[in-house]
């Protein structure tokens, strides 16, 4: 039961995390105008990975996409790449983990295969989360650098005659969404990896023989000793060709007449 719970929770946490990464990537508020001495501004600027926007106090908002690819800063391109890689890996991870879930039965998929898929999706979630965290952190670092540079140049006008106030940008909501989402995806991935350990049959260097206490039938089960007690019920009336990989969270019941090989 604990393994299924861990796997399920890992999946849900990762799903929320990846949804958050997608949301953060699409959001326009990666950087917002710093209202350092003016909490209410008549013109408010904010920027995303794909476009920049201006919101006026009239209520009018205008957004313009970055229609150039070569003219954009390399750092912005890198952040875009990291976020997209994170989304792609996360999406593949979600797809893999759906089939890996213990509560979902697909044909006669072995538990060892499910364990491998759980591990694969877990690793994908971890990498996805790290990509998102890295992308957001790179952008945040870029903002901090530009912030202090613009602060240094804040009131450098032509001979001090005309004030040219430079617009400074600070952390936008998307950065926090990205950090949290990346963290959740990472945690979800770790949970999937932990669940994989519970799913995986422990390899031994001998063949386990399972004895049924109920009668004459003897089930020979190659595989891990963990599942070799032979007391698990096979209520679905299907033959036990699963290599003996049983887990503690499968329903345990007394042997019945359906226990056969």
């Amino acid at each position: 039961m604990a393994v299924t719970a861990c796997q399920g929770l890992g999946f849900v946490v990762s799903l929320i995390g990846i949804a958050g990464i997608i949301a953060a990537t699409c959001m326009d508020q990666w950087s917002t105008q710093d209202l350092y001495n003016n909490p209410v501004t008549a013109v408010f600027n904010y920027q995303g990975l794909w476009r920049s926007c201006v919101r006026e106090s009239s209520g009018f908002t205008e957004c313009r996409g970055y229609f150039t690819l070569l003219g954009l800063p390399a750092m912005l391109q890198a952040v875009r790449a990291l976020m997209i890689v994170g989304i792609v890996l996360g999406a593949i991870g979600l797809l893999v983990s759906i089939f890996a879930l213990k509560c979902i039965r697909i044909g006669s998929m072995e538990d060892s295969a499910k364990a491998n898929m759980t591990l694969t999706s877990g690793i994908m979630f971890i990498v996805s989360g790290l990509c998102a965290i890295a992308g957001v952190s790179v952008f945040a670092n870029m903002l901090v650098t530009n912030f202090w540079m613009s602060t240094a140049n804040m009131y450098t006008g032509m001979g001090g005659m005309v004030q040219t106030v430079q617009t400074r940008y600070t952390f936008g909501a998307a950065l926090f969404v990205g950090w949290v989402a990346g963290g959740l995806t990472l945690i979800g991935g770790v949970m999937m990896c932990i669940a994989c350990r519970g799913l995986a049959p422990e390899e031994t260097n001998y063949k386990a023989v399972s004895y049924h206490a109920s009668g004459h039938s003897v089930a020979y089960k190659p595989g891990g000793f963990k599942a070799s007690t032979g007391f698990g019920s096979n209520t679905k009336n299907k033959k036990i060709y699963d290599g003996g990989a049983r887990t503690e969270d499968e329903v345990q019941s007394y042997p019945s007449k359906h226990d056969y090989v």
């Epitope: 008549a42 920049s52 201006v54 006026e56 009239s58 209520g59 009018f60 004030q163 106030v165």
Partner: antibody, heavy 115, light 113 residues
Framework: EVQLVESGGGLVQPGGSLRLSCAVS?????MNWVRQAPGKGLEWVAW????????TYADDFKGRFTISRDDSKNTLYLQMNSLRAEDTAVYYC???????????WGQGTLVTVSS | DIQMTQSPSSLSASVGDRVTITCKSS????????????LTWYQQKPGKAPKLLIY???TLESGVPSRFSGSGSGTDYTLTISSLQPEDFATYYC?????????FGQGTKVEIK
């Protein structure tokens, strides 16, 4: 079509109070009060976001004037306290539009502060 | 606060003349986010409310005749009436629309010569 109709102006003694109203019809995201003293130029008084109620004032009016709105009546208000002789002016309510320009103005209401 | 200085304070002109009014701001009104200058021009006739002519320094408000045009960037702006018409005799104001508090120029009165 946007329509703005001011009311509430009149004669008031120095130190007195007055509340101006502006009946609004049509789409208004943000509204303002702008005044014009006799024979003088235009002076912006206050701004309000009609959805959030967030206000902003010119420094000369902070603490004395309060801009507010009543959604149910679709009315904009300017509560003026501690009035001085120099507050004598025609008060306009005006809608802010794209580019932060005032496109629709009321007909104006005259406020005279005199003893 | 941003100070707005208009010149001249008044001018006399004849119908058909080309008229130019300048407005200078104490700070740049150019917004880096959209590269637009937040300067607005108004026309006011005696006893009437002002009328919006131009916003974003050069964008003509709908219904305003094309003889009116605006230009400029940063701190220096110009309103031009290419061919003055009888109905154009009025007072013209520029406005800082970039930051609170919104501030107006002192006005330029265009009179008949």
């Amino acid at each position: 079509e946007v329509q703005l109709v001011e009311s509430g102006g009149g004669l008031v003694q120095p130190g007195g109070s007055l509340r101006l109203s502006c009946a609004v019809s049509g789409y208004t995201f943000s509204m303002n009060w702008v005044r014009q003293a006799p024979g003088k130029g235009l002076e912006w008084v206050a701004w309000i976001n009609m959805y959030t109620g967030e206000p902003t004032y010119a420094d000369d009016f902070k603490g004395r004037f309060t801009i507010s709105r009543d959604d149910s009546k679709n009315t904009l208000y300017l509560q003026m306290n501690s009035l001085r002789a120099e507050d004598t002016a025609v008060y306009y309510c005006a809608r802010l539009v794209r580019g932060n320009g005032f496109d629709y103005w009321g007909q104006g209401t005259l406020v005279t502060v005199s003893s | 606060d941003i100070q707005m200085t208009q010149s001249p304070s008044s001018l006399s002109a004849s119908v058909g003349d080309r008229v130019t009014i300048t407005c200078k701001s104490s700070q740049s009104l150019l917004n880096s986010g959209n590269q637009k200058s937040y300067l607005t021009w108004y026309q006011q006739k005696p006893g009437k409310a002002p009328k919006l002519l131009i916003y974003w320094a050069s964008t003509l408000e709908s219904g305003v005749p094309s003889r009116f045009s605006g230009s400029g960037s940063g701190t220096d702006y110009t309103l031009t009436i290419s061919s003055l018409q009888p109905e154009d005799f009025a007072t013209y104001y520029c406005q800082n629309a970039y930051s609170f508090p919104f501030t107006f120029g002192q006005g330029t009165k265009v009179e008949i010569k």
